[in-house]
């Protein structure tokens, strides 16, 4: 008799793929544009990335450091009108893209939460949650919560409002903290909260360190759903050298949880390469004309247009990983087992029941390495085969689809491999 199929877990929409943050509408659209109507015209691009949700804004009225002149129910006229927002929501829904609204109150000011009148501010947030839920948004984000006093109790209250409206609504909290204990204390009283943090931001050093960070986090959070990013708002290039971007894309898309990216992460957008651009929100490079300030500063291979035409580009890798992440059961909700593969390497398996399984091997080092995969670390339910098919490599030159002998696996510097193999009873 065939073994019984394992019961599928309840899957919320944010479990099914990546979230894409557009914190600065003007920087995202460029050319002096930057409103909701313009963003609507970019939804096809977001669809092509196969992302499941757009984290937008903040876009509300906020006079810097002035509680009274901050209105979370009103869209700043610079970004458009409520009608523009409704129209964006409708278009996004048609493309199966969910919209999450950032309600961080004092986003133009010194302290995101004003550090004053918390009763008034919290009431404004509460009213805003109710208002925008009725308007049809799919969730909310609040950032810098390490600077909100009694954050846990407020998050619990806001979570109740959000989930009370519908279980299908999401609350994301962001913190600059990278301290696991602080992160856990924020998660403690908030069961379904998705938390973005700087926890992984110093993981770029070695495979062992990254493995240790990831496994510690997963062990500490138990079976709750995680999100994976390097910060609550900033670009990957703020933390990583260019040669590790592909490796991190592969890792973020294949860890158990929701990957969260900022606009531009898919093309390796780097503020440092664009003189005069702010680190936190450089202009998005749609094509070579997107940054006219310094002629010749932008080459085609730095842009969406250029990378779209190159199957070996970072953007093409992002699209492929996003596609895999959203359709493979083992990547959607599969079990995760990390195991030893030798110094400098981080390797793990994702598997779900009798579905196709995935092996990820990441070389963080700047020298080529032979992987010594220690299958003995793995439980019987996740055993390794002798060979696995190469689904993709972060480096060019490998023949995709070809079977690789796992005992003889060699990785180039900064190379990541995604391999697949079938379930064997």
């Amino acid at each position: 008799r065939a073994p019984r199929c394992r019961e599928l877990p309840a899957q919320k929409w944010w479990h099914t793929g990546a979230l894409y943050r557009i914190g600065d509408l003007q920087a995202f659209q460029g050319h002096g544009a930057g409103n909701l109507a313009g963003l609507k015209g970019r939804l096809d691009y977001l669809s092509s990335l196969k992302v499941k949700g757009l984290v937008l804004g903040p876009i509300h009225k906020n006079q810097k450091d002035d509680v009274a002149q901050t209105d979370l129910l009103q869209i700043d006229p610079n970004f458009g009108s409520k009608e523009d927002f409704d129209s964006l929501l409708q278009s996004a829904k048609k493309k199966s893209i969910r919209v999450i609204l950032d309600l961080t109150p004092n986003y133009r000011g010194e302290n995101s939460w004003f550090s004053t009148q918390v009763d008034t501010v919290a009431t404004k947030v509460k009213d805003a949650l109710e208002f925008w839920l009725q308007a049809g948004v799919d969730g909310f984000q609040v950032r810098d919560i390490e600077n909100l006093k009694d954050a846990s109790s407020f998050l619990a209250e806001w979570q109740n409002i959000t989930k009370g409206f519908s279980e299908d609504r999401l609350l994301i909290a962001g913190t600059n903290s990278s301290d696991l204990q602080q992160i856990l204390s924020l998660l403690e009283s908030n069961k379904d909260l998705l938390l973005t943090s700087s926890y992984l931001s110093d993981s770029g050093s070695t495979g062992e360190h990254t493995k240790s960070l990831v496994t510690q986090y997963l062990n500490a959070t138990g079976n709750r759903w995680c999100s994976w990013s390097l910060s609550q708002a900033r670009l990957l290039t703020s933390f990583l050298p260019a040669q590790l971007l592909r490796l991190y894309q592969l890792m973020l898309f294949t860890l158990p949880g929701t990957p969260v990216f900022s606009y531009g992460d898919e093309i390796g957008l780097d503020a440092a390469a664009l003189p005069g651009q702010p680190m936190e929100a450089p202009v998005m490079l749609w094509d070579e004309s997107s940054f006219p300030d310094i002629p010749g500063a932008v080459s085609a291979n730095m842009t969406v247009k250029g990378q779209s035409e190159d199957p070996g580009s970072l953007l093409s890798l992002f699209r492929r990983l996003s596609d895999q992440r959203s359709k493979e059961r083992s990547l959607l909700h599969g079990d995760f087992h990390a195991f030893s593969a030798g110094p400098g390497l981080f390797s793990y398996i994702r598997h779900w029941d009798q579905n196709e399984r995935f092996l990820v091997v990441l070389n963080f080092g700047d020298v080529g390495l032979s992987a010594g995969l220690q299958a003995s670390d793995l439980p019987a339910s996740a055993s390794l085969p002798a060979k696995a098919d190469l689904l993709l490599s972060t480096q060019p030159g490998r023949e995709e689809g070809s079977p690789l002998e796992l005992e003889r696996l060699k990785l180039e510097p900064h190379e990541g491999l995604l391999l697949r193999f079938p379930y064997a009873a």
Epitope: D65, N111, V118, T123, E146, K149, S153
Partner: antibody, heavy 117, light 107 residues
Framework: EVKLEESGGGLVQPGGSMILSCVAS????????MNWVRQSPEKGLEWVAE??????????HYAESVKGRFTISRDDSKSTVYLQMNNLRAEDTGIYYC????????WGQGTLVTVSA | DIQMTQSSSYLSVSLGNRVTITCKAS??????LAWFQQKPGNAPRLLIS???ILETGVPSRFSGSGSGKDYTLSITSLQTEDVATYYC?????????FGGGTKLEIK
């Protein structure tokens, strides 16, 4: 115009009880955290207690020195905050102010509590 | 509990001069700091909250600065009506605590 008016102070013997009231007007009382703060020449300004909103389940916090003896409560329908003080001690003597918000953007003029035999 | 320390109990400053009053917290308070002014016989009056945010109606000669554990109240040009006692208060975590106060006098 925001107004806070305390009442209920006076002379009380050690071990005795007293209830202070603070009536508020000129703002949405039910949306405001309310505090009691006291002042004495010996201890200066000393925060006593805070009460939050209905949506926070009327959460309360107290200074260590009054925990178990003082109780803060509110009646949103009357825009009034109370401080029930039991087992009073000489060191509880001072002017008691109620204040609105976090921090106290508005204060009443205070009511004097004297604990003496 | 977080202790708040105002280093000067008394300050004597000439009219028109700049005044700086400092306040140190025993732990990080993430800018959840207020400055109050109190004149004899009156209740305290909030001048600054959130370490830097000037309350409506407070003269622009008053300003607040600082972050982490160290905070400062400045008066650019001392006026007669500024004679008072100034208190800092942290309201980041309960129990909220006040500094001991700095009494400002005209030299």
């Amino acid at each position: 115009e925001v107004k806070l008016e305390e009442s209920g102070g006076g002379l009380v013997q050690p071990g005795g009880s007293m209830i202070l009231s603070c009536v508020a007007s000129g703002f949405t009382f039910s949306n405001s955290w309310m505090n009691w703060v006291r002042q004495s020449p010996e201890k200066g300004l000393e925060w006593v207690a805070e009460i939050r909103l209905r949506s926070n389940n009327y959460a309360t916090h107290y200074a260590e020195s009054v925990k178990g003896r003082f109780t803060i409560s509110r009646d949103d329908s009357k825009s009034t905050v109370y401080l029930q003080m039991n087992n009073l001690r000489a060191e509880d003597t001072g002017i008691y102010y109620c204040s609105r918000g976090d921090p106290g953007a508005y204060w009443g003029q205070g009511t004097l509590v004297t604990v003496s035999a | 509990d977080i202790q708040m320390t105002q280093s000067s109990s008394y300050l004597s400053v000439s009219l028109g001069n700049r005044v700086t009053i400092t306040c140190k917290a025993s732990d990080h308070i993430k800018n959840w700091l207020a400055w109050f002014q109190q004149k004899p016989g009156n209740a305290p009056r909030l001048l600054i909250s959130g370490a830097t945010i000037l309350e409506t109606g407070v003269p622009s000669r008053f300003s607040g600065s600082g972050s982490g554990k160290d905070y400062t109240l400045s008066i650019t040009s001392l006026q007669t009506e500024d004679v008072a006692t100034y208190y800092c208060q942290q309201y980041w975590s309960t129990p909220y605590t006040f500094g001991g106060g700095t009494k400002l006098e005209i030299k």
